[in-house]
């Protein structure tokens, strides 16, 4: 039996885009590629694999806003930005099966509901392949 | 012979926490998980594998301090922050077998020795599995 | 037949250094190690594998400059810094086969052509092994 050098199984990763955020709600995320190894459900990114994740968040907003990125109810946010017009942040966090990554947004004006987002992008990349996963 | 798709060997990574730093010394690091693939020894994180590492450092300090994160005697620091009360930094560095990652802290007051740390966390994640390792 | 636990094939990664940048051109990059899994050609880093890349850019410049890091003609830059004397940035970007990572530099003075760089370093690390590569 000839041994083929092992290939890497696909790494859990996803890039979602968002062009609009809603006050008191979140940002409407869409995955532009069908080849992503992670999924979007109910406007959240579903975590199937335990481990560290590299998280990149970018965007320019049409209004000043406060934005948080959450992963679990009752836990503090992965990112929290207050009264900003843009974000360009990178972080590392330990996430686990059943976590869901989602936005919360608050604007400081009552004259508009939706915020336009330029270059809105959220990337998650699993850093611990080989660890526990459940699908 | 049935071929099972290859699994990833565990990636070298660790998350340590620190709640206290000592003036003229460092921060007291503990690893909350027993499943870490890297080890703490003499208040340092031991590097067994050559390669790039993703490094995340976070914390809020009870006093203003200057903080450096070193990996090898005679080499410049991985991070160096002067007169700060918090840190939230990410970096990439090439580390090698026999390196040790440790803190050095200086406060600018003689009235206290220990600094309390809220949310003190240091994460290292190896980025080049497949490279040289020695255990 | 005895099964040997699979090893990781080498991850695509590179660290290049630059000590000089030219106005209206770019920065002269050199790879200090012969063991790099990625190559430099015509002052650009060649991308062979599709996927996310972790990108680290550092340097102190002898003159104020505007610096951009590009990967594809007609696309926006990976990094863009205006009128700076130093850079210490980390980003994540999706790059693909045939992309080339290169600098563009502009100074705001007509009295010199070359900018000296202290600690100039650019690191790229592929985050999606197992994806498409062409050599």
């Amino acid at each position: 039996l000839q041994q083929v050098p092992p290939q890497y199984p696909p790494i859990q990763s996803i890039r979602v885009q968002f062009t609009r955020c809603e006050n008191e709600k979140g940002c409407i995320i869409t995955s532009p590629s069908k080849d992503e190894t992670m999924k979007v459900q109910d406007n959240s990114i579903i975590i199937n694999c335990d481990g560290f994740y590299l998280i990149s968040l970018k965007g320019y907003f049409s209004e000043e806003l406060s934005l948080s990125l959450y992963y679990r109810k009752g836990r503090g946010p992965l990112f929290s930005l207050s009264k900003v017009t843009s974000v360009d942040s990178i972080g590392v966090a330990y996430l686990a099966f059943k976590d869901k990554v989602y936005f919360n947004v608050t604007t400081h004006s009552t004259s508009y509901k939706d915020i336009q987002v330029n270059g809105g992008e959220l990337i998650l990349i699993h850093q611990n392949p080989g660890g526990f996963c459940a699908y | 012979l049935q071929q099972v798709p290859p699994q990833y060997p565990p990636i070298q990574s660790i998350r340590v926490q620190f709640t206290r730093c000592e003036n003229e010394k460092g921060c007291i690091i503990t690893s909350p998980s027993k499943d870490e693939t890297m080890k703490v020894q003499d208040n340092s994180i031991i590097i067994n594998c050559d390669g790039f590492y993703l490094i995340s450092l976070k914390g809020y300090f009870s006093e203003e301090l200057s903080l450096s994160l070193y990996y090898r005697k005679g080499r410049g620091p991985l991070f160096s922050l002067s007169k700060v009360t918090s840190v939230d930094s990410i970096g990439v560095a090439y580390l090698a077998f026999k390196d040790k990652v440790y803190f050095n802290v200086t406060t600018h007051s003689t009235s206290y020795k220990d600094i309390q740390v809220n949310g003190g966390e240091l994460i290292l994640i190896h980025q080049n599995p497949g490279g040289f390792c020695a255990y | 037949l005895q099964q040997v636990p699979p090893q990781y094939p080498p991850i695509q990664s590179i660290r290049v250094q630059f000590t000089r940048c030219e106005n209206e051109k770019g920065c002269i990059i050199t790879s200090p190690s012969k063991d790099e899994t990625m190559k430099v050609q015509d002052n650009s880093i060649i991308i062979n594998c599709d996927g996310f890349y972790l990108i680290s850019l550092k340097g102190y410049f002898s003159e104020e400059l505007s610096l951009s890091l590009y990967y594809r003609k007609g696309r926006g830059p990976l990094f863009s810094l205006s009128k700076v004397t130093s850079v210490d940035s980390i980003g994540v970007a999706y790059l693909a086969f045939k992309d080339k990572v290169y600098f563009n530099v502009t100074t705001h003075s007509t009295s010199y052509k070359d900018i000296q760089v202290n600690g100039g370093e650019l690191i790229l690390i592929h985050q999606n092994p197992g994806g498409f590569c062409a050599y």
Partner: antibody, heavy 122, light 107 residues
């Protein structure tokens, strides 16, 4: 409510100079980049000039480079366009508009003022 | 620099669909934004990022973009939609580039 109010438009002779103003209200002016866009009578829209939120970075359309200067006074919530060496082809309605930083990978204008008319004629 | 081509005028029957096109070399690889300008008024953004609608813009306005053509569609044109429509793209060298505009008449 976001408001952008332009003023300063006038009838000018070729070679003359004029300064347009745009007073902003209803938002944190110092947080947002701004632009000037013009529209010649019966013609289409043309971007003229851009300034970053802090005022440190500017850019211009080739047609006005070296003649027009964009600036801002964040303390007064006011955007300016200094127009020198005016030509007949500069005749247009000048709009100030709110936009995104030019380092963004894309860009558009999402708030516009009502415009001020500049006429250049001998 | 980058050029956007629009038809100068377009007629549409009341409550019928209107399709306004914007041509450009490989425009599908860029994002297209659309503005409506009624007579004597300032332009108003009606579509950004090819197909996103700002708050307050009616659902009858939609956008699409592929190949060498971007299209603004008004699913059932009303009299109040009579206006000039401009497409715009962002070009790293020329910055904001506008089409010449299409004058829509609702019959």
């Amino acid at each position: 409510e976001v408001q952008l109010v332009e003023s300063g438009g006038d009838l000018m002779k070729p070679g003359g100079s004029l300064r347009l103003s745009c007073v902003a209200s209803g938002f944190t002016f110092s947080s947002f980049p701004m632009s000037w866009v013009r529209q010649a009578p019966g013609k289409g829209l043309q971007w003229v000039a851009y300034i970053h939120s802090g005022g440190s970075s500017t850019s211009y359309a080739d047609a006005v480079k070296g003649r027009f200067t964009i600036s801002r006074d964040n303390a007064k919530n006011t955007l300016y366009l200094q127009m020198n060496s005016l030509r007949a082809e500069d005749t247009a309605i000048y709009y100030c508009a709110r936009t995104f930083p030019t380092v963004a990978a894309d860009n558009w204008f999402y708030y516009w003022g009502q415009g001020t008319l500049v006429t250049v004629s001998s | 620099s980058y050029v956007l081509t629009q038809l100068p005028s377009k007629n549409v029957t009341l409550k019928q669909a209107a399709h306004i096109t914007c041509g450009g070399d490989n425009i599908g690889s860029k994002s297209v934004h659309w503005y409506q300008q009624k007579l004597g008024q300032a332009p108003v953004l009606i579509i950004y990022y090819d197909s996103s609608r700002p708050t307050g813009i009616p659902e009858r306005f939609s956008g699409a973009n592929s190949g060498n053509t971007a299209t603004l569609t008004i699913s059932g044109a009303l009299a109040e939609d009579e206006a000039d429509y401009y497409c715009q793209v962002w070009d790293s060298s020329a910055k904001w580039v506008f089409g010449e505009g299409t004058q829509l008449t609702v019959l």
